[in-house]
Interface confidence: medium
């Protein structure tokens, strides 16, 4: 059969027998469109697309509307793989959601839900999750039913605040929620009692600002 | 009382390595992370990076990820601070200052009195 | 990163005068501030902390007020040992300096 040269996702890459962790170009769904991407082909059996990555402080995440759909950052360390994508490719499948979280302390913890999709940016990309399970904690920290993405240009939270710009970030705000992950990185010893850090409520709490955090994502019949 | 003393002036060439040492006296070493702070001649204040003496961790500024190293040897209370790949504009004056110890990880109390760095061909 | 940014660049003033200086981040610190005070050939020596709070053995004369963006360090009657250049820092989202304020004698 003939080889196949193009990827909607990183599962599909792993399938076709690269198994090595690294920067790979993606194919947007029914497009020509490219997209780079990071694949983990090792953590829990490889084949996730990395569609977000905190880790050092090194990428500003106070970004627009625009940005976030498009993406931004350097798929090798910290990045956005952008709305658009992931909104097109969870629309094809069904997809699972990963997120695996670290603290200052050397703890690990992930949350997994067991179907997840964004919706189109005409409905502001709102988010679409069920089935929680993971260590990080019982009660899920993306507000539930999904919330409609909202950054600094793009106030769509359900806030008389601006959540985005108060918190900084684009994210699925509530009014403003247990979660932003795309919240100011600080560094060791400056993050706890910060509102507007990388937040996961049920886990680490309301000011605890985290180390690092991956959102993966993997078609769930893999 | 406390005192951070340490090593004296260096000159070195374009891309080699520098090494300085910052000796702790007066206080309990482990108990107080270190930081390393630059100031070119006549310029404003740089922060480098931080090491907690008890563990080792580290933690360096985006500019001098890659490039600087710090380590330390509790045996001795001392601290080091090295950065490779000398470039010219690495050659200001180098401090050590300990933090003071809150919980914001925040003001330098005490500091080195300074290492000058000269890095030329 | 968050920006420092002094005023004056220099201040000339007389012993015994009341000196102002100012520092403005470009966003909120809280009161994660510090001020410190540098003679040439010297390493900085702490000032003031957590905006107000005055370090060890530092005089009364010096004094500090402001929190989130606006900051100010009051020397009410300046000493001869007060000429010198200062310097603002923050240390609530990472660690940054000011360029720093020359007090010249007038």
């Known amino acids: 059969k003939e080889e196949q040269t193009t990827f909607r996702d990183c599962a599909e890459i792993f399938k076709s027998g690269l198994t090595t962790s690294g920067i790979y170009t993606l194919t947007f769904p029914n497009s020509t469109e490219e997209i780079k991407a990071y694949c983990d082909m090792e953590a829990g059996g490889g084949g996730w697309t990395i569609i977000q990555r905190r880790e050092d402080g090194s990428v500003d995440f106070q970004r627009t509307w625009k940005e976030y759909k498009v993406g931004f950052g350097n798929p090798s360390g910290e990045y956005w793989l952008g709305n658009e994508f992931v909104s097109q490719l969870t629309n094809q499948q069904r997809y699972v959601l990963k997120i695996h979280l670290k603290d200052w302390e050397g703890n690990e913890a992930y949350s997994l839900y067991e179907h997840f999709y964004l919706s189109s940016e005409e409905l502001n990309y709102r988010i679409h999750l069920k089935g929680l399970t993971g260590t990080a904690g019982k009660i899920s920290s993306i507000s539930q039913p999904g919330n409609d993405f909202s950054t600094k240009d793009g106030d769509n939270d359900k806030c008389i605040c601006k959540c985005s710009q108060m918190l900084t970030g684009g994210w699925w705000f509530d009014a403003c929620g247990p979660s932003n992950l795309n919240g100011m990185y600080y560094p060791q010893r400056q993050n706890t009692n910060k509102f507007n850090g990388i937040k996961w409520y049920y886990w680490k709490g309301s000011g605890y600002s985290l180390k690092a955090t991956t959102m993966m994502i993997r078609p769930a019949d893999f | 009382q406390v005192q951070l003393v340490q090593s004296g002036a260096e000159v070195t060439k374009p891309g080699a390595s520098v090494k300085v040492s910052c000796k702790a006296s007066g206080y309990t070493f482990t108990a107080y992370h270190m930081y390393w702070v630059r100031q070119a001649p006549g310029q404003g204040l740089e922060w480098m990076g931080w090491i907690n003496p008890n563990s080792g961790g580290t933690n360096y500024a985006q500019k001098f990820q890659g490039r600087v190293t710090m380590t330390r040897d509790t045996s001795i209370s001392t601290a080091y601070m090295e950065l490779s790949r000398l470039r010219s504009d690495d050659s200001p004056v180098y401090y050590c200052a300990r933090d003071q110890g809150i919980a914001a990880a925040g003001p330098f109390d005490y500091w080195g009195q300074g290492t000058l760095v000269t890095v030329s061909s | 990163e968050i920006v420092m940014t002094q005023s004056p660049a220099t201040l000339s003033v007389s012993p015994g005068d009341r000196a102002t200086l100012s520092c403005r981040a470009s966003q909120s610190v809280s009161s994660n501030f510090a001020w410190y005070q540098q003679k040439p050939g010297q390493a900085p020596r702490l000032l003031i902390y957590?905006?107000?709070t005055r370090a060890t053995g530092i005089p009364a004369r010096f004094s500090g007020s402001g929190s989130g963006t606006e900051f100010t360090l009051t020397i009410s009657s300046l000493q001869s040992e007060d000429f010198a250049v200062y310097y603002c820092q923050q240390y609530h989202y990472w660690w940054t300096f000011g360029q720093g304020t020359k007090v010249e004698f007038k």
């Open positions: 957590g905006s107000s």
